[in-house]
């Protein structure tokens, strides 16, 4: 039995005609099975295969090799969260967080909790103490005074 064009199988009861449109992107093998074109997958070959490494959770694509990020995610593979706008010395595990690095505080991680270590403001052998975000106090040796023991 010879099947008509695009019909396959015993009894010619399988249909496959190559297509490359909204409904699918496939060719047909000798048994009438759909064989997806490069970059496509799924039962109807209408799901794009995203860029290798594209986060399955935070990235997606409608065209092969693409990787479009969900809101709040960034990077080539959509695997990097976007921190809170204005976050200075902080990172995120989830979008819009601002988790402060060591010795930084405040909502935007812009307050120095180790002013003494960062700026070493005390002169002339003064001893520096961190007293709060962006705050410090110098204990001056005998014979020196002023906020930074500069006098």
């Amino acid at each position: 039995v010879t099947c008509d064009d695009y019909y396959y199988g015993f009894g010619c009861n399988k249909f496959c005609r190559p297509r490359d449109d909204f409904f699918g992107h496939y060719a047909c093998d000798q048994n009438g099975n759909k064989t997806c074109m490069e970059g496509w997958m799924g039962p109807e070959c209408n799901r794009a295969i995203c860029r290798q490494g594209c986060s399955p959770k935070h990235g997606s694509c409608k065209l092969p090799g693409d990787c479009r990020c969900q809101y709040g995610w960034q990077g080539l593979y959509c695997d990097k969260c976007i921190p809170h706008p204005g976050c200075v010395h902080g990172i995120c595990n989830e979008p819009w967080q601002c988790l402060c690095e060591t010795n930084w505080g405040g909502q935007l991680c812009d307050k120095d909790l180790n002013y003494c270590g960062t700026h070493q403001p005390c002169l002339n052998g003064g001893t520096c103490s961190n007293t709060g975000p962006d705050k410090y106090q110098c204990s001056c040796p005998e014979g020196y005074s002023g906020p930074n023991c500069e006098i």
Partner: antibody, heavy 116, light 107 residues
Framework: QVQLVQSGAELKKPGASVKVSCKVS????????IHWVRQAPGQGLEWMGI????????KYAQKFQGRVTMTVDTSTSTAYMELSSLRSEDTAVYYC?????????WGQGTLVTVSS | DIQMTQSPSSLSASVGDRVTITCRTS??????LTWYQQKPGKAPKLLVY???ILAAGVPSRFSGSGSGTDFTLTISSLQPEDFATYYC?????????FGGGTKLEIK
Amino acid sequence: QVQLVQSGAELKKPGASVKVSCKVSGYAFTDYAIHWVRQAPGQGLEWMGIINTYYGDSKYAQKFQGRVTMTVDTSTSTAYMELSSLRSEDTAVYYCARGYDGFAYWGQGTLVTVSS
Amino acid sequence: DIQMTQSPSSLSASVGDRVTITCRTSENIYSYLTWYQQKPGKAPKLLVYNAKILAAGVPSRFSGSGSGTDFTLTISSLQPEDFATYYCQHHYDIPWTFGGGTKLEIK
């Protein structure tokens, strides 16, 4: 087994909107497109549009462009069809259907009546 | 849009008769054609897809043929349960239009 279960009958006033749901079970929801078809009383079948359930992309018949919106909620395996600016001629049974090579599975239909 | 012309629009026949319904399209749709049967108050039922493939569970007295622009649904020996309305539909490109229907009645 494959099932498409639609929401109940609706009575709407002209100018209003209606949103019909189609809850799917028995297969992977995002593997198959959902189509919407309507049938006015005593009339034939009219194809309204298709939605790709994986991406949420939809294509509509020209006649309904601008008035119809098809959406999906993959978390509940439900497709929705919303028709706005209703008029009396929109009185019909609205069906959802699954398929690529024709519609092997249909919802039971939702009667939408538009009357003042 | 592809136009679907289905004929006849109505048909009277008797149990045991051989019945043919035709569907003509305004352009080549290859074999992207489907036939449905619908009974009052029910959703349509798929009979034949891709012009000539019988859907699962459909009796062998139903058959489809044709390709390109001319298609036929044949019922070789009408049974009482076959009296219904029949529709063709193409699924080649958007929109997937239906034919106007053929109402098959008992003579």
